[in-house]
């Protein structure tokens, strides 16, 4: 008795975070024996879509010509071979930006900060939101989510950093969102350049670059330090 068919690989191109109105392609890669591919979306009737394989049959393409709220969500894919259906792929979370107006990102007291001092990045939305994400350019993931404890709506979230080092220098953006769908984000804020001066650690890197360490920093969240903000939001480290 053969074991279960290996799970396929699922990914989105050009990426999994897509602006409203832009196109996205979802790829499901299985084996050369695949006869059919199926894409399921969480909380939607299954199958969400079916596709015949592309030659040489080891993958299928699912095209979304224009990203909207309806396409945001969590997907899995399967393939069918002569011996049956495969295991499900690992999930793909497709996020849409542009669902809400962009928040404003500022630095208090200033975006020019001396190494060793404190700075707070403040993300403010025009309408009340319950989730805020801080993104650093050249980071693979959000630095952190701040999410309200009990669904309380907030106009802002604070991201304190103390003490600041050269690692904190760089370009930041923030997003806001409603908790009912973390697959829908606002437009990104305008970028904020945080410049760290007077570093004691040696030469400061270019402000738009992360500092390299053995751990591969550009894939690792950069954790702002300090106390939990007073806004009633709770930290969710990514």
């Amino acid at each position: 008795q053969a074991g279960p068919l290996p799970k396929p690989t699922l990914w989105a191109e050009p990426g999994s975070v897509i602006s409203w109105g832009n196109s996205v392609t979802i790829w499901c890669q299985g084996t050369l024996e695949a006869r059919e591919y199926r894409l399921d979306k969480e909380e939607s009737p299954a199958p969400w879509d079916r596709q015949n394989p592309l030659e040489p049959k080891n993958k299928a393409r699912f095209s979304i010509p224009s990203m909207t709220e309806d396409y945001a969500g969590r997907y899995r894919c399967y393939y069918r071979s002569p011996v049956g259906w495969s295991q499900p792929s690992d999930p793909l979370e497709l996020v849409m930006t542009g669902a809400y107006s962009k928040p404003t990102l500022s630095a208090l007291p200033s975006p020019l900060v001396t190494s060793g001092k404190s700075v707070t990045l403040l993300c403010q939305s025009r309408s009340p939101m319950d989730t805020f994400l801080l993104i650093k350019e050249r980071a693979a993931h959000p630095l952190l989510h701040l999410r309200s404890e009990h669904g309380a709506q907030q106009h802002q979230a604070e991201f304190p950093m103390s003490p600041v080092t050269s690692v904190h220098g760089g370009t930041y953006r923030c997003f806001s969102s409603h908790g009912f769908s973390h697959y829908l984000l606002s437009h990104p804020s305008d970028p904020l350049e945080l410049i760290v001066s007077g570093s004691l650690e040696g030469p400061r890197p270019s402000p738009t670059r992360s500092v390299s360490t053995a751990a591969g920093p550009e894939d690792q969240p950069l954790m702002p330090t300090g106390s939990v903000p007073h806004s009633g939001l709770r930290r969710h480290w990514e």
């Epitope: 975070v17 832009n22 392609t25 751990a215 591969g216 894939d219």
Partner: antibody, heavy 121, light 107 residues
């Protein structure tokens, strides 16, 4: 700062297999797309294919039957194999990468220095 | 598959001139277009992504515009160090494709 370095033989015989490896340093390979691009002498850039960090691949259709790109996350490397080479495959071969998530895109902002591979008997 | 066509294939301009290079996609690609600069004997360098976003460290005399099928790279005031071949590349969905290149020279 992420750096990419190609390695492999500079001379390959016709009908044999061209094998190149790209080593990624200064960061983890486990994020986003890693590509191979080539440039024949005096000509333009030609995209060969990419591998997504989870193993998903896409290749240029005209090369698909001869190309395999694979990734070894434990060694922070990805590799190119091109079978049945001819003189037309003589080119500078570049590895390149795009590693980010939240401005999720496939453009290439990390490049290796390139390695010239000559196909000749 | 989507084809990318650049024009002109070569051009010669004077220092200080405004230079425009165009790239046309055979089908719509949203704003998923990048521009690269390759100086003679050097590795290609990313200039612009998402059609109009300037890569960090690239001089502000470079700009990009367009969406859908028609895109433009503009150098507002040509400098001697801008002598290079410029390539557009689409990355909305595989196969990624480069334009054939535009060779820029100084008069």
């Amino acid at each position: 700062q992420v750096q990419l370095q190609e390695s492999g033989p500079g001379l390959v015989k016709p009908s044999e297999t061209l094998s190149l490896t790209c080593t990624v340093s200064g960061g983890s390979i486990s994020s986003h797309y890693w590509s191979w691009i080539r440039q024949p002498p005096g000509k333009g850039l030609e995209w060969i294919g990419y591998i997504y960090y989870n193993g998903g691949t896409n290749y240029k259709p005209s090369l698909k039957s001869r190309v395999t790109i694979s990734v070894d996350t434990s060694k922070n490397q990805f590799s190119l194999k091109l079978t049945s080479v001819t003189a037309a495959d003589t080119a500078v071969y570049y590895c390149a990468g795009r590693r980010y998530y939240y401005d999720s895109s496939g453009y290439l902002d990390y490049w290796g220095q390139g390695t010239l591979v000559t196909v000749s008997s | 598959d989507i084809q990318m066509t650049q024009s002109p294939s070569s051009l010669s301009a004077s220092v200080g001139d405004r230079v425009t290079i165009t790239c046309r996609a055979s089908q719509g690609i949203s704003n998923y277009l990048a521009w690269y600069q390759q100086k003679p004997g050097k590795v290609p360098k990313l200039l612009i992504y998402a059609a109009s976003t300037l890569q960090s460290g690239v001089p502000s005399r470079f700009s990009g515009s367009g969406s859908g099928t028609d895109f433009t790279l503009t150098i507002s005031s040509l400098q001697p160090e801008d002598v290079a071949t410029y390539y557009c590349q689409k990355y909305n969905s595989a196969p990624w494709t480069f334009g054939q290149g535009t060779k820029l020279e100084i008069k």
